[in-house]
């Protein structure tokens, strides 16, 4: 029961995380104009991974896409790549984890396969979360560097008479969304991996009680292999699986005619 809960919770947390990563990637507020030196501006600038926007006090907002690939900074391209990789891995992970969920029965899928799929999706979520966190952190680092560089040349004068205020950018909402979302995906992935570890032993214990006589005792070796004691070794010619300690009788989830022979 705890394993199912852990797996389900891991899936939900990862789902929220990946939705957040997608949202962050699409958001325009990766960097927003720093208003510290010019709090009375009537024009507000903010930038995303795909376009930059200008919002005027009047409410009119104009956004322009970055219609160039070669002209963009390498760091921005790297951040885009990390976020897309994170989304793709997360999406695949979600797809895999849906089939791996204990509460969902698909055909004659073995629990060992479900355990492996849970582990696979968990790893995918972890990598996805790390990609998002890395992408957002790289962008944040880029902002900090540019912020202090622009602060150094904040004012460029023409004979000291005319001032040109250079626009500085600070952390936008998308960065915080990305960090939180990446963290959630990472946590969800860890939960899936933990669920995978507990998936097989719980399965075997439950099945052993349901399929054997009450006097039949089942012992577990630390390695996770089943060792039968009592009525002889493997009396019903049941195949022992290394991965999930499962029997041929247990392949199908619903009762079949073989269960009653």
């Amino acid at each position: 029961m705890a394993v199912t809960a852990c797996q389900g919770l891991g899936f939900v947390v990862s789902l929220i995380g990946i939705a957040g990563i997608i949202a962050a990637t699409c958001m325009d507020q990766w960097s927003t104009q720093d208003l510290y030196n010019n709090p009375v501006t009537a024009v507000f600038n903010y930038q995303g991974l795909w376009r930059s926007c200008v919002r005027e006090s009047s409410g009119f907002t104009e956004c322009r896409g970055y219609f160039t690939l070669l002209g963009l900074p390498a760091m921005l391209q790297a951040v885009r790549a990390l976020m897309i990789v994170g989304i793709v891995l997360g999406a695949i992970g979600l797809l895999v984890s849906i089939f791996a969920l204990k509460c969902i029965r698909i055909g004659s899928m073995e629990d060992s396969a479900k355990a492996n799929m849970t582990l696979t999706s968990g790893i995918m979520f972890i990598v996805s979360g790390l990609c998002a966190i890395a992408g957002v952190s790289v962008f944040a680092n880029m902002l900090v560097t540019n912020f202090w560089m622009s602060t150094a040349n904040m004012y460029t004068g023409m004979g000291g008479m005319v001032q040109t205020v250079q626009t500085r950018y600070t952390f936008g909402a998308a960065l915080f969304v990305g960090w939180v979302a990446g963290g959630l995906t990472l946590i969800g992935g860890v939960m899936m991996c933990i669920a995978c570890r507990g998936l097989a032993p719980e399965e075997t214990n439950y099945k052993a009680v349901s399929y054997h006589a009450s006097g039949h005792s089942v012992a577990y070796k630390p390695g996770g292999f089943k060792a039968s004691t009592g009525f002889g070794s493997n009396t019903k010619n049941k195949k022992i699986y290394d991965g999930g300690a499962r029997t041929e009788d247990e392949v199908q989830s619903y009762p079949s005619k073989h269960d009653y022979v």
């Epitope: 009537a42 322009r64 001032q163």
Partner: antibody, heavy 117, light 113 residues
């Protein structure tokens, strides 16, 4: 059709308060802002302040202590209140609607205010 | 506050003449985000409220004749009337719409010779 119309007292005594109402039609005050501009007789334009659709306000730094702008969205009315009037506050007061680039594309006809005892 | 300086304060012209007036700001009105200059030009005819001519320093308001041209960037701006008409005899104001307060220039008065 966008229209703005100012209505004021005409004559105000020094040290008193001035209240002007701008009634708008053809657009919503929840979406668009209203700027106030005045023009002393024979002189240039002076921007006083603005109230935006979201209710946020900005005032001219020289008038911030005695100027307030408010609005009633449901009645499509914007109010300007200027306290402690002096003779140099004598002017024609205009309300205007800003849009693209914060430029004012529609103006009222203005209301003339004289500060005199 | 951004100070707007207009020159000349008055211009005496004849109908059909080309006219140029200047507006300088104490700070740059160029927004790096969209590379637009937040400067506006108005025309005020005697006894009338001002009317918008040009925004973003060079974009003509709809209905404004194409004889009006705005140019310039950063701190130096120009309004050009290619062929002055009788109805153009008015006072022309530039306005900073980039930073509060949204200050006006003192105006350039266009008079008939």
């Amino acid at each position: 059709q966008v229209q703005l119309k100012e209505s004021g007292p005409g004559l105000v005594a020094p040290s008193q308060s001035l209240s002007i109402t701008c009634i708008v039609s053809g657009f919503s005050l929840t979406t668009y802002g209203i700027s106030w501009v005045r023009q002393p007789p024979g002189k240039g334009l002076e921007w006083l302040g603005v109230i935006w659709g979201d209710g946020s306000t900005h005032y001219h730094s020289a008038l911030i202590s005695r100027l307030s702008i408010s609005k009633d969205n449901s009645k499509s009315q914007v109010f300007l209140k200027l306290n402690s009037l002096q003779t140099d506050d004598t002017a024609t007061y205009y309300c205007a609607k800003p849009y693209y680039s914060n430029a004012m594309d529609y103006w009222g006809q203005g209301t003339s205010v004289t500060v005199s005892s | 506050d951004i100070v707007m300086t207009q020159s000349p304060s008055s211009l005496t012209v004849t109908v059909g003449e080309k006219v140029t007036m200047s507006c300088k700001s104490s700070q740059s009105l160029l927004n790096s985000g969209n590379q637009k200059n937040y400067l506006t030009w108005y025309r005020q005819k005697p006894g009338q409220p001002p009317e918008l001519l040009i925004y973003w320093a060079s974009t003509r308001e709809s209905g404004v004749p194409d004889r009006f041209t705005g140019s310039g960037s950063g701190t130096d701006f120009t309004l050009t009337i290619s062929s002055v008409q009788a109805e153009d005899l008015a006072v022309y104001y530039c306005q900073n719409v980039y930073s509060y307060p949204l200050t006006f220039g003192a105006g350039t008065k266009l008079e008939l010779k």
